[in-house]
């Protein structure tokens, strides 16, 4: 006859080992006991468990709890045992001694792996903001045995970079994702992706991209000079801009408060009917963390009742910003 | 101040493709993202994803093969494509405002206005 | 079954505080923002609550917020009749599925 067993068997962390140890005999043998046993090299042999046809199961005091049979219908052939809850500490090389009848005493080794799956972390990294050169984006660790793969799945352009630190029963391994911070990245995900062996399917972490910007400011409404006449009703100024985040709004004039009756809605200047005193400078404060920009504009109130001949000035603007 | 519309048909057939479109007055699509939420009846909300006023889109990820939301800034609207409905589309759709940053530590992401919702029912 | 857990419904009488909660876990509500929202029965929901504390403007103060964890609260205070309504928790989800979450949603009912 002959034992059959496997080369390797593999584990996940917390799940149940079967190690298989069968007598395949000839017709009339019989198995008289199985003796499992560690079998590392340089740490002797620590029994586990003894299988007898007669007296049953013994399990040695160290594995007490952790070694069983595996349930009926039992094969008097099989001298498979189960090894519960399987820890990093089990994996190794184990041997199953069988004695038979007739046939005498036989042996087979086989090795336990006990895989350990990983709990990736993703970290982001500092604030990202327009105008920074190549910046940490987000960096993902995952711990685990054998190493994990750590890989990212995005639309974005940049560049990865991975190190790993072995440890004496598993390996972690961290990748970090730069880039060049822009606008166009916003809202852009940027996914962790570990895969693993003792993974049912791969662990994913997603980070959404934002990068802090402010847009130079403008102001629309005054494209046509000859609207702003005494009178008119409905004018307005919009101030325009963009932002990450989205920036707020306040309107001032410069050269002096703004004239009653002017409201001021967000990003909006709303007029009442105009007047010679609505002429001025009007400045548009755009602001949000990052940054804040301005952009003035003169406002000339034509009256047709005044000299026809008089010049009037072109429309001016001006932008000044900085950053916070 | 700002205003959200939901519009688009009540009714759609299974299998067919669910369109809704938000239109935003009273300010201006740009520097914010844009989501669509949606609620069967009786039941809780259901983020379905976002858009940024650049195009950069976001699904979830239990809708995302049918899902396609765009941006139209001339006409300052966002639009919610759903396709291959079933009943269990079902719901009253919501578009938002998100205010959607993240500040170097945490996610500031929270939904600032709504739309009023418009029910779709999926029957034949 | 929802990513966010609340109890599905809490009751008060009038002028009593309630409170309701919302459990997560770290690739949530521990790492991230929460803020809540307030839906009256046939009505778009409101924003009630945002970055775990702050109230947007015209909301009164005895509606508060709380984060600690894996957890979030939402505190009423001095309970109206008027506060009778649904309210969900929110917030972004970093894992596997990752998107904005909301909590299953919580029925205050105000008695008497």
């Known amino acids: 006859g002959e034992l059959e067993t496997s080369d390797v068997v593999t584990v996940v962390l917390g799940q149940d080992a079967k190690l298989p140890c069968f007598y395949r005999g000839d017709s009339g043998e019989q198995v008289g006991q199985v003796a499992w046993a560690r079998a590392d090299a340089g740490e002797g042999a620590q029994e586990l468990a003894l299988l007898h046809s007669k007296y049953g199961l013994h399990v040695s005091p160290a594995y007490e709890g952790r070694v069983e049979q595996p349930p009926p219908p039992r094969n008097p052939l099989d001298g498979s045992v189960l090894l519960r809850n399987a820890v990093q500490a089990d994996e190794g090389e184990y041997e199953c001694r069988v004695s038979t009848f007739p046939a005498g005493s036989f042996q087979a080794r086989l090795r336990l792996r006990v895989l350990v799956p990983p709990l990736p972390s993703l970290n982001p990294g500092p604030a990202l903001e327009e105008g920074q050169g190549l910046t940490l984006a987000a960096s993902c660790t995952a711990e685990g045995s054998p190493a994990p793969s750590v890989t990212w799945d995005t639309e974005v352009k940049g560049t990865t970079s991975s190190r790993s630190f072995k440890h004496s029963r598993s390996a972690a391994v961290t990748s970090e994702f730069h880039l060049v911070p822009s606008r166009s990245m916003n809202g852009q995900p940027l996914t962790c992706v570990v895969s693993h062996p003792g993974l049912l399917q791969d662990q994913r972490i997603t980070h959404i991209l934002h990068v802090s910007f402010l847009a130079e400011a403008s102001v629309r409404g005054l494209e046509d000079q000859n609207l702003w006449h005494v009178g008119r009703e409905g004018a307005m100024l919009k101030c325009l801009s963009e932002g990450q985040p989205p920036p707020s709004y306040n309107w001032t004039r410069l050269d002096g408060p703004l004239p009653s009756g002017v409201r001021v809605d967000g990003d909006t200047l709303g007029f009442p009917p105009l007047t010679t005193e609505h002429s001025g400078i009007y400045v548009c404060h755009v602001s949000n963390e990052f940054s804040s920009r301005d952009s003035q504009v003169t406002v000339d109130v034509l009256d047709p009742q005044e000299d026809s001949g008089k010049q009037v000035d072109l429309v001016s603007a001006s932008h000044h910003h900085h950053h916070h | 101040q700002v205003q959200l519309q939901e519009s688009g048909p009540g009714l759609v057939k299974p299998s067919e493709t669910l369109s809704l479109t938000c239109t935003v007055s009273g300010g201006s699509i740009s520097s914010y993202f844009w989501s669509w939420i949606r609620q069967p009846p009786g039941k809780g909300l259901e983020w379905i994803g976002y858009?940024?006023?650049?195009?950069?889109?976001n699904y979830n990820p239990s809708l995302k093969s049918r899902v396609t939301i765009s941006v139209d800034m001339s006409k300052n609207q966002f639009s919610l494509r759903l396709s291959s409905v079933t009943a269990a589309d079902t719901a009253v759709y919501y578009c938002?405002?998100?205010?959607?940053?993240?500040?170097?530590?945490?996610?500031?992401?929270?939904?600032?206005?709504w739309g009023r919702g418009t029910l779709v029912t999926v029957s034949s | 079954q929802s990513v966010l857990t609340q109890p599905p419904s809490v009751s008060a009488a009038p002028g009593q505080k309630v409170t309701i909660s919302c459990s997560g876990s770290s690739s949530n509500i521990g790492n991230n923002y929460v803020s809540w929202y307030q839906q009256f029965p046939g009505t778009a929901p409101k924003l009630l609550i945002y970055?775990?504390?702050k109230r947007p403007s015209g909301i009164p103060d005895r509606f508060s917020g709380s984060k600690s964890g894996t957890s979030a609260t939402l505190g009423i205070t001095g309970l109206q009749t008027g506060d009778e309504a649904d309210y969900y928790c929110g917030t972004w989800d970093s894992s596997l599925n990752a998107g904005w979450v909301f909590g299953g949603g919580t029925k205050l009912t105000v008695l008497g």
């Open positions: 970055d775990n504390n």
């Open positions: 858009i940024y006023y650049s195009g950069n889109t």
């Open positions: 938002a405002r998100d205010f959607h940053h993240y500040d170097g530590s945490a996610y500031r992401w929270y939904f600032d206005l």
